[in-house]
């Protein structure tokens, strides 16, 4: 703010005086000065700020005959219909040649009925869950009391007497409303009525029941809903191999995700429609009537690997002697993990099965005992994960290979022994 | 609490001079100004003049300018009238009074009085 | 120099009465006016300035109004306290003026 200098005596020859009054009141600020020659324009400063669109008027008149003489000033401010904005400490600002000169202050204040500067709010809040509220009110006069009342019910014997500012709630077990009484030497002010909503508490103890490659069942405690049963419990899954990851607070999940509703009770859910062999985030919020609880923290969890669903494709086994070459095809049908290899069995109409491991090789040649005389031989594949062998093929027979012939090929026609795996929400 | 104190009565032939005083207390001594006005005995009230103890720049009332000094000396937080040839139409009741902060010709505080008479 | 016209001179009134003391000024003072209340023997007392700002400590019966030349002091209801003489000054430039005076007596 500009400050006068003392230089040279200050001009001015009355200050603003104090305004202290109700919302709505009309006053009047005024600054005097007496001036040689040209009078100054008259600046008004609220807080030490130059008010640009004040409602001023400015009334100068000579002293003598001469425009050197000195001259009267006079500066009014209007304060038509005095608000909370308008209070503050006032000065005048004049500029006289190099110098500035700034009044005495006056003061604009409110005395009246007592003025709300923080009321309760409307919130939600979990059942038995610890919360506090404001009010805070102002007058003058001071001081300001404040009475506290729950469903219209006084918390307190009298203003002033119970709490102040802030309202600690311990708890509630129902939707109610809260409001505040201000009172002061004017009279009483009552502030908005908050309804502060119940909600059930967030559910605790999210965890994996039991994994399977395409469904995983989850369970929960509930948290406490107060005098309102729980409706329903809403569980979300989302896929978290995406890179993205969630974090433990992260408010929305990155992609859209699966969402399922259990009735409660048993508090508990089976999740299908998986991927196998999946990273995913899970989380659960639990509604009364009232609302919805928080949702939990996302919960990490994989669906374990399964068994490839289908054998190898197109299996093809020829004899040549004492030698038989076999090659396939990796399964068409999901392989529900890591695939780390086949197996192979060939077994004669007489002989014992022979089970070999091939690998992830996806052709082998074996080597027949004696001189290939055993007879109807016939080969099976199946591929294998950690979790498991997949279906073993259709015995595959062995076929002579003749010269300037093409190897001959099966196809299989046996269909896989679980349905076809589908993805209705992916 | 604000008060002005003024010197006790006089009794001046014509032609002599006479200085009263008016100690202030409680408040700032040179924030306004110190009016001086007088009353002849059941007669209105009549302007002298002022002083701004600040700076010690004066007004005075033209009808009385030449026989009245104002002065002041801010260290004791006194003010002074002193009046020369003095007549019989002199005679009244002297008058120190405080300029009000809002206005300092509006008078807010004033001493007990000083009763001068001229014979 | 400005003149205040100050009327009636005198005035006779009852307790609980309302009372109005006019002040006339040769020229707009702006509303730099203000009444004062002198009682027999006492230096006067600052009631009103500004034309209707009340002086600290001045029942609300005292009440002042006007603008530019014309003003009014009134007293809404007049109490045994408030027999006294009442004088306008025009605080807006020197040499200041008073009015001469309004005497409320008792009816």
């Known amino acids: 703010a500009p400050r006068g200098t003392q230089a040279e005596e200050s001009p001015f020859v009355g200050n603003p005086g104090n305004i202290t009054g109700a919302r709505g009141l009309t006053g009047t600020l005024r600054c005097q000065l007496q001036v040689q020659g040209e009078p100054p324009e008259v600046h008004w400063l609220r807080d030490g700020q130059i008010l640009e669109l004040a409602d001023s008027t400015q009334t100068q008149v000579p002293l003598g005959e001469d425009e050197q003489d000195d001259w009267i000033v006079v500066s009014q401010l209007r304060i038509t219909s005095l608000q909370l904005s308008d209070t503050g400490q006032y000065q005048c600002l004049v500029f006289l040649g190099h110098q500035t000169f700034v009044s005495q202050p006056g003061y604009v204040g409110l005395e009246g009925l007592p003025y709300f500067l923080e009321e309760p709010e409307d919130r939600t809040v979990a059942a038995n869950t610890p919360f506090n509220l404001s009010c805070q009110a102002q007058g003058p006069p001071e001081p300001v009391d404040l009475l506290w009342l729950q469903d219209a019910v006084p918390l307190a014997t009298a203003p002033g007497h119970g709490p102040q500012r802030s309202l600690h709630v311990p708890g509630l077990n129902k939707t109610s409303s809260f409001s505040c009484e201000a009172h002061n030497a004017k009279g009483v002010t009552t502030s908005r009525t908050a309804t502060i909503t119940v909600l059930p508490q967030q559910p605790r103890n999210l965890h994996l029941v039991s994994r399977q490659p395409t469904e995983l069942e989850v369970a929960w405690t509930p948290g406490l809903s107060g005098i309102y049963p729980l409706t329903h419990c809403t569980l979300q899954a989302v896929l978290s191999d995406d890179g993205m990851g969630i974090q433990a607070g992260e408010p929305d999940p990155p992609e859209e995700p699966l969402t399922s509703q259990a009735s409660v009770p048993p508090h508990q859910l089976r999740l299908g429609s998986l991927h196998p062999h999946t990273p995913y985030h899970i989380r659960v919020a639990c509604t009364s009537s009232q609302g919805p609880s928080s949702w939990t923290h996302w919960l990490p969890v994989e669906t374990p690997e399964g068994v490839p669903l289908g054998p190898p494709e197109n299996i093809s086994a020829t004899r040549n002697g004492s030698q038989a070459f076999v090659h396939w095809q990796e399964p068409r049908a999901p392989l529900q993990g890591t695939l780390l290899g086949y197996r192979l069995a060939y077994q004669g109409q007489d002989t014992p099965e022979v089970l070999m491991d091939i690998g992830l090789r996806q052709e082998v040649t074996l080597e027949l005992q004696g001189d290939g005389s055993v007879s109807n031989l016939t080969v099976c594949v199946a591929a294998y994960t950690a979790a498991g062998d997949g279906p073993w093929s259709l015995p595959v027979p062995l076929e002579a290979w003749r010269p300037g012939q093409a190897q001959p090929v099966h196809q299989l026609v046996k269909e896989p022994s679980t349905p076809a795996f589908s993805w209705p929400w992916w | 609490e604000v008060q002005l104190v003024q010197s006790g009565a006089e009794v001046k032939k014509p032609g002599a001079t006479v200085k009263i005083s008016c100690k202030v207390s409680g408040y700032s001594f040179w924030g306004a100004t110190m009016n001086w006005i007088r009353q002849p005995p059941g007669k209105g009230l009549e302007w002298i003049g002022l002083i701004k103890p600040s700076n010690g720049g004066t007004s005075y009332n033209q009808k009385f300018k030449g026989r009245v000094t104002i002065s002041a000396d801010k260290s004791i937080s006194t003010a002074y009238l002193q009046w020369s040839s003095l007549k019989a139409s002199d005679t009244a009741m002297y008058y120190c009074?405080?300029?009000?902060?809002?206005?300092?010709?509006?008078?807010?505080?004033w001493g007990q009085g000083t009763l001068v008479t001229v014979s | 120099d400005i003149q205040m016209t100050q009327s009636p001179s005198s005035l006779s009134a009852s307790v609980g009465d309302r009372v109005t003391i006019t002040c006339k000024a040769s020229?707009?003072?702006?509303?730099?006016v203000a009444w004062y209340q002198q009682k027999p023997g006492q230096a006067p007392r600052l009631l009103i300035y500004?034309?209707?700002t009340r002086h600290t400590g001045v029942p609300s019966r005292f009440s002042g109004s006007g603008s530019g030349t014309e003003f009014t002091l009134t007293i809404s209801s007049l109490q045994p306290d408030d027999f006294a003489t009442y004088y306008c000054?025009?605080?807006?430039?020197?040499?200041?003026?008073f009015g001469q005076g309004t005497k409320v007596e008792i009816k």
């Open positions: 000054q025009e605080h807006f430039s020197p040499p200041l003026t």
């Open positions: 500004w034309q209707d």
């Open positions: 020229q707009d003072v702006v509303s730099a």
């Open positions: 009074a405080h300029g009000h902060y809002e206005s300092y010709e509006a008078m807010d505080y």
